[in-house]
């Protein structure tokens, strides 16, 4: 058992069928000594006296505020979350795997530049009784300040028959270097408490390999004389990381009707503009990636070819 | 004061070329190593990620672009100091941040070289012979040493009696090519930022 | 099963003009670009010109420009060349291509030799 | 226009052993470079798109690098069936243009 915040206790089971379970003493937070009670929830049944209160902790039923009463008075509480473990394997049931980029992927997380700062983002399709709380470092074993803000619901969406909810957080590195190179990854530690369940899920990155660029901004056209082509210009997004010549990014430049089936034009350049042949009711698209570490590209940029 | 693209400064350009290269050959290298090696810890989530020039020589910091010098978090140490010749710098342009920025480069490179070197002549002696350092990686740093063109005391290859133990050669080869990517990609950047300044 | 399958070999006389067909067979043929480019003996690739059959665009080389057309009938799912005013050095294989990308490709017919000579 | 170079222009190989083309562009093109094989009395055969991509049905003994104006084609060890002639082209501008080709030879 141990301490996730005052007065909360994560009891680590190991959940099998018959399992002993695992022996909790709990003691009320008071100078009292005689007349104290004990109850479970809302329940009135006292389950027994004393300062102390032992307990076999197998189910989830045995989990919950326990209170210790003197006198129709509450002196204190103690939440009991249960974490399991099966087949030596911590439970995974509140988040959803994303699969990307590969199994048991739970979070998620981008930067938009070298700045430090990045968001993670985790699914769920529970709706209700459901908390988080995040911790972040670089390093583990001689941690360096990161800050996290609030876990909050950032997007709804129907999958099938089922509801799926988006939580995301954002996190700053306390002191961060747009151009150092990074020899300590990212350590990100995500609590979930859904009911009387606990689950803590992790990440761990370089801010390099997360680094999804903003779409480019601006997008052009200009049509060139007596020619099919077309000249389409951009700029830098605003967000990415400066000075440009240092922080450079490369672009993709794409003409595509309305179907990915559809044929198209494509070029790659380090420039900010290019030429491409367009068509009717297609779209000229453009993204961006960092020129000299290929994570990931931008969202794709849009302008149509009329 | 913007320079136009199409003509850069023809001191810097043979190094932004060779920059360029450089994490060409470096990446395809890891790439290579990660492939053949798949039963090794060789991915960057499975090494440890050490720097061999640390504490040597302080290239992140010389080559800061004069933007990000406001920034406390990137002014740790910027005492090294470093010879101030090379043929990547034209004259106008020679100032003591960009030679000391440069020599900092040369001597990463250096080390690295000597590294590699001394790695490579033990995955020979490998009965296996399942992975060798790739010969136009060498080159690279070669060339762009050359283009750097700086004066330094030659640092003797290491050699080892004892019988080397090829699993941790191996490793360390990998730890060794993670690291030099990202050394890398510092060079191409300074040498994209001095391109354009 | 995707092929482009060319017009015969040709022989003509200079001054005069070839039309070279390639049909397509396997796919929607108005899905992808279509190319010609042709070969002199023992000499590289040289690109002449591209059609897109959806809409009858077309883009040349500056080499070729004027003496050559490239037309496309999709009805029969034929693209065909025509260069006109042939010298001794139009003598090559002639080859279509197509992709659904605009700029490289990815199924080639067979050749069509075109020999110029009087 | 651009101009496609290509190094060497005959490379004599073992069977075996790997063997690496060059080809260069007079300006740079990103990665907008392409791979071909042709065989005498056939027509090419693409190998490699946009310089690294490989294609489906090319065997993985075919990679491609470069960026730029640099590129390389590396057969890491040389089939029977890869002696050949290779092209490079560029997509980068109009017109298309292609290397004079590499005639790969058995040594």
């Known amino acids: 058992i141990w301490e996730l915040k005052k007065d909360v206790y994560v009891v680590e089971l190991d959940w099998y069928p018959d399992a002993p379970g695992e022996m909790v003493v709990l003691t009320c937070d008071t100078p009292e000594e005689d007349g104290i009670t004990w109850t479970l929830d809302q329940s009135s049944e006292v389950l027994g006296s004393g300062k102390t209160l032992t307990i076999q902790v197998k189910e989830f039923g045995d989990a919950g505020q326990y209170t210790c009463h003197k006198g129709g008075e509450v002196l204190s509480h103690s939440l009991l979350l249960l974490h399991k473990k099966e087949d030596g394997i911590w439970s995974t049931d509140i988040l959803k795997d994303q699969k990307e980029p590969k199994n048991k992927t739970f979070l998620r997380c981008e930067a938009k530049n070298y700045s430090g700062r990045f968001t993670c983002w985790w699914l769920t399709t529970i709706s209700t009784d459901l908390t988080f709380s995040v911790k972040s470092s670089r390093g583990s074993s001689d941690p360096q300040g990161v800050t996290c803000g609030a876990a909050t619901l950032s997007a709804e969406r129907v999958r099938g028959d089922n509801k799926e909810y988006e939580y995301s957080v954002e996190c700053q590195e306390d002191s961060a270097c747009p151009a150092a190179e990074e020899s300590l990854p990212i350590e990100v530690m995500v609590d979930a408490v859904h009911k009387l369940k606990y689950e803590n899920y992790t990440s761990s990155f370089f801010i390099r390999d997360i680094i999804k660029p903003d779409p480019p901004k601006n997008l052009q056209l200009k049509p060139l004389k007596n020619s099919r082509q077309v000249e389409v210009s951009w700029e830098y997004p605003d967000t990415w990381s400066t000075p440009h010549s240092y922080f450079s990014l490369t672009f993709c430049v794409q003409v595509q009707g309305k179907s990915k089936r559809e044929k198209k034009d494509r070029v790659f350049t380090d420039k900010t503009s290019a030429t491409v042949i367009c068509r009717k009711n297609a779209s000229i698209s453009v993204r961006a990636q960092d020129r000299y570490y290929s994570s990931s590209w931008s969202e794709w940029a849009s302008v149509p070819c009329s | 004061r913007n320079l136009p693209v199409a003509t850069p400064d023809p001191g810097m350009f043979p190094c932004l070329h060779h920059s360029q290269n450089l994490l060409r050959a470096v990446s395809n290298m890891l790439q290579k190593a990660r492939q053949t090696l798949e039963f090794y810890p060789c991915t960057s989530e499975e090494i440890d990620h050490e720097d061999i020039t640390k504490d040597k020589t302080s290239t992140v910091e010389a080559c800061l672009p004069l933007e990000l010098t406001k920034n406390e978090s990137c002014l740790n140490s910027r005492e090294t100091s470093f010879i101030t010749n090379g043929s990547c710098l034209a004259s106008r342009k020679t100032s003591f941040m960009m030679a000391l920025c440069l020599s900092s480069i040369y001597e990463d490179l250096k080390m690295y070289q000597v590294e590699f070197k001394t790695m490579n002549a033990k995955l020979l002696m490998d009965p296996k012979r399942q992975i060798f350092l790739d010969q136009n990686m060498l080159a690279v740093i070669d060339e762009l040493m050359q283009a750097l063109n700086f004066n330094s005391e030659t640092v003797p290859q290491k050699s080892s009696l004892e019988e080397p133990d090829f699993y941790k050669t191996k490793i360390k080869l990998c730890i060794l090519l993670h690291a030099f990517r990202i050394r890398a990609v510092t060079i191409d950047r300074v040498m994209s930022y001095l391109n354009a300044s | 099963q995707v092929q482009l399958v060319q017009s015969g070999a040709e022989v003509k006389k200079p001054g005069s003009s070839v039309k070279v067909s390639c049909k397509a067979s396997?796919?929607?043929?108005?899905?992808?670009?279509l190319h010609w480019s042709r070969q002199a003996p023992g000499q590289g690739l040289e690109w002449m010109g591209w059609?897109?059959?959806?809409?009858?665009?077309?883009e040349y080389a500056p080499k070729f420009q004027g003496r050559v057309t490239i037309t496309a009938d999709e009805s029969t799912s034929t693209a065909y060349m025509e260069l006109s005013s042939l010298r001794s050095e139009d003598t090559a294989v002639y080859y279509c291509?197509?992709?659904?990308?605009?700029?490289?490709?990815?199924?080639w017919g067979q050749g069509t030799l075109v020999t110029v000579s009087s | 226009d651009i101009v496609m170079t290509q190094s060497p222009l005959s490379l004599p190989v073992t069977p075996g052993e790997p063997a690496s083309i060059s080809c260069r562009a007079s300006?740079?093109?990103?990665?907008?470079l392409h791979w071909y094989q042709q065989k005498p009395g056939q027509a090419p055969r693409q190998l490699i798109a946009?310089?690294?991509q490989s294609i489906s049905g090319v065997p993985s003994r075919f990679s491609g690098s470069g960026s730029g104006t640099d590129f390389t084609l590396t057969i890491s060890s040389l089939q029977p069936e890869d002696f050949a002639t290779y092209y490079c082209?560029?997509?980068?501008?109009?017109?298309?243009?292609f290397g004079q080709g590499t005639k790969v030879e058995i040594k």
């Open positions: 291509a197509r992709n659904k990308e605009l700029r490289y490709f990815d199924v």
């Open positions: 396997g796919g929607t043929f108005s899905d992808y670009y």
């Open positions: 059609i897109d059959p959806e809409n009858g665009d077309t």
């Open positions: 300006q740079s093109i990103s990665i907008n």
């Open positions: 946009f310089a690294s």
């Open positions: 082209q560029q997509s980068n501008s109009f017109p298309l243009t």
